[in-house]
Structures are given as C-alpha cells and as structure tokens.
C-alpha cells in the first residue's frame, strides 16, 4: 500500500531536501526558510533566494519551513498549575512544566496539569515521583490505597475494592454498602 500524501507533501517530495516546489511554477525548487523565520515571498526563479523574514515577538518556527506565518507562542496554563520553564524564542516554543515536588498528569496529548507528589503518609515509597508520574506508594497494614493515598481500613465499605486489602478489619466496619462518598 502506498501511503496517502497531502498536497504539500507531494509537492515537497519532488524537490531535494531543504527545498520546496514553487506554488505557481512546479519546475522551480525554492530553498526553505530557516527555523526562526517564515516565508515572505517565494524565490523568483531557480537558484534565486527565497525571501524569508524573522518571526515577530510572540511567534516562532522550530524547524525549516515554508510557512506564510510563524506559529503563536504557547502560554503556560496557570489554572493547571503550570509554570514557564523557558520563554518562547523565534525558533523555540515556550516550555511549560511543574514546580519542584510536583508531577505532570496528562489529561490529553496537549493538556497537562501539575499535581503534588504523594508523600505516602501511612505507607512507604515504592517508586519515587517522576516528571510525568506520581510517587507509587505501598500502604502499611490497616490502610488501603485510594487515589494514591493510604486511607484507613475503617473507611473501607464492603462494596469497594479495598475489601480484599482490609479483609481482617472489614468485619468491624459498620457501613455495609458504599454510598459512593469518600
């Protein structure tokens, strides 16, 4: 099977690397613009320079390109607890991250939120907190893991998963049905 190529990929594939086909004349290959710049005007003819201009403040291109406009710099999402690790430059987007003792939880490919690393109170650290993963805790006897926190078995209701972990204690628990509360 031949992979389907978009129009731009088809046009680019006819020219050597680092060049692209002139949109109005497919016999001309123009040199792509360097990162940090964008295409202002196509080259007028073979062997002639492409007119590339530097990206304006607040925009960037991170690779060689023939884009008509630079890309807007990303903004770190304060409501997600993100902080700016490095500012946007003409050739690199803003880098966002989390504070010390926090990890990134990705809700989607493009959306992460910063959460505090679990301290494993009433348990021990099985795996340390990583950039993109919370601490993995192992709970002491009489405690079970719920949302990565060690919770007392006295909070375990019979219909919850914790019944296996809290088996000796479960007979002492007064509540027999889980109402879904925590």
């Amino acid at each position: 099977l031949v992979p389907h190529l978009g129009d731009r990929e088809k046009r680019d594939s006819v020219c050597p690397q680092g060049k692209y086909i002139h949109p109005q004349n497919n016999s001309i290959c123009c040199t792509k613009c360097h990162k940090g710049t964008y295409l202002y005007n196509d080259c007028p003819g073979p062997g002639q320079d492409t007119d590339c201009r530097e990206c304006e403040s607040g925009s960037f291109t991170a690779s060689e390109n023939h884009l008509r406009h630079c890309l807007s710099c990303s903004k770190c999402r304060k409501e997600m607890g993100q902080v700016e690790i490095s500012s946007c430059t003409v050739d690199r987007d803003t880098v966002c991250g989390c504070r010390k003792n926090q990890y990134r939880h990705y809700w989607s490919e493009n959306l992460f939120q910063c959460f505090n690393c679990s301290l494993c109170l009433n348990g021990t650290v099985h795996l340390s907190c990583q950039e993109k993963q919370n601490t993995v805790c192992t709970c002491h006897a009489g405690f079970f893991l719920r949302e990565n926190e060690c919770v007392s078995c006295s909070n375990c209701k019979k219909s919850l998963e914790c019944t296996k972990l809290c088996l000796p204690q479960i007979e002492n628990v007064k509540g027999t049905e889980d109402s879904g509360t925590t």
Epitope: R77, H105, W107, S108, E109, N110, L111, F115, E147, N148
Partner: nanobody
Framework: EVQLLESGGGLVQPGGSLRLSCAAS????????MLWVRQAPGKGLEWVSV????????YYADSVKGRFTISRDNSKNTLYLQMNSLRAEDTAVYYC???????????????WGQGTLVTVSS
C-alpha cells in the same frame, strides 16, 4: 457510533444526594479521560469534574469540591457522579463527555450525551 447515555437525574431537596450514571459505547472507554459538565438554566456550559482513563486521577471545579465524587468502572463502560450536600445552584442539565485526545482545555470534548436534569428545590 459513539454513544453516551446519562441517567439518575431528578428532583431532590437541598442537602440531598443523587448518583448520576453514564453508559458509554462505540469507543474504547478505558482509553479516554472522561468528564461531567453541566448547564444551568440560562447559563453556559461549566465543567464539573474530570477523571483519568484508568480512574486514578480526579479533579473537581471549586464549586463542587468536597461534595461531588467522580468515578468510573471500565469493566462496565460506565462513568458515575455521586452528588452530596446538593444546593439550589447545582440545578442544571448534567452531561457526561469524552475528552478529545488533542484537547487543550476541559471544554475540548468531542462527544457528549443528551444530558440528565438535576433539580434541587424544596
């Protein structure tokens, strides 16, 4: 075809509780972040709570924190919202939604259900 079907809404007195359910089909439920969003009469959509694909990470809007609990059962392809200490301002149509894989915020969902009405009134 993706389908999300909410149930469990109704009329409840202030301080009361309700448990909403959302049955999902037509996609691999266990692979996706899911959320509950709501729309109060005459207001815009407001996200309420979100839960990660495997169910270990949850997050709540300040307005419901400590009162609502989101959970999921991936073996049953079902999302839940336990609502306690309900207030008049919680009156809304509640929708369950699937977060887009490329989402840049909690309003970037690509599928949602028909909604279930929750009315909190004495």
């Amino acid at each position: 075809e993706v389908q999300l079907l909410e149930s469990g809404g109704g009329l409840v007195q202030p301080g009361g509780s309700l448990r909403l359910s959302c049955a999902a089909s037509g996609f691999t439920f266990a692979n996706y972040t899911m959320l509950w969003v709501r729309q109060a009469p005459g207001k815009g959509l407001e996200w309420v709570s979100v839960i990660s694909a495997e169910g270990r990470t949850t997050y709540y809007a300040d307005s419901v924190k400590g009162r609502f609990t989101i959970s999921r059962d991936n073996s049953k392809n079902t999302l839940y919202l336990q609502m306690n200490s309900l207030r008049a301002e919680d009156t809304a149509v509640y929708y369950c939604a699937k977060l887009n894989m490329k989402a840049t915020n909690f309003k970037d969902f690509d599928y949602w259900g028909q909604g279930t009405l929750v009315t909190v009134s004495s």
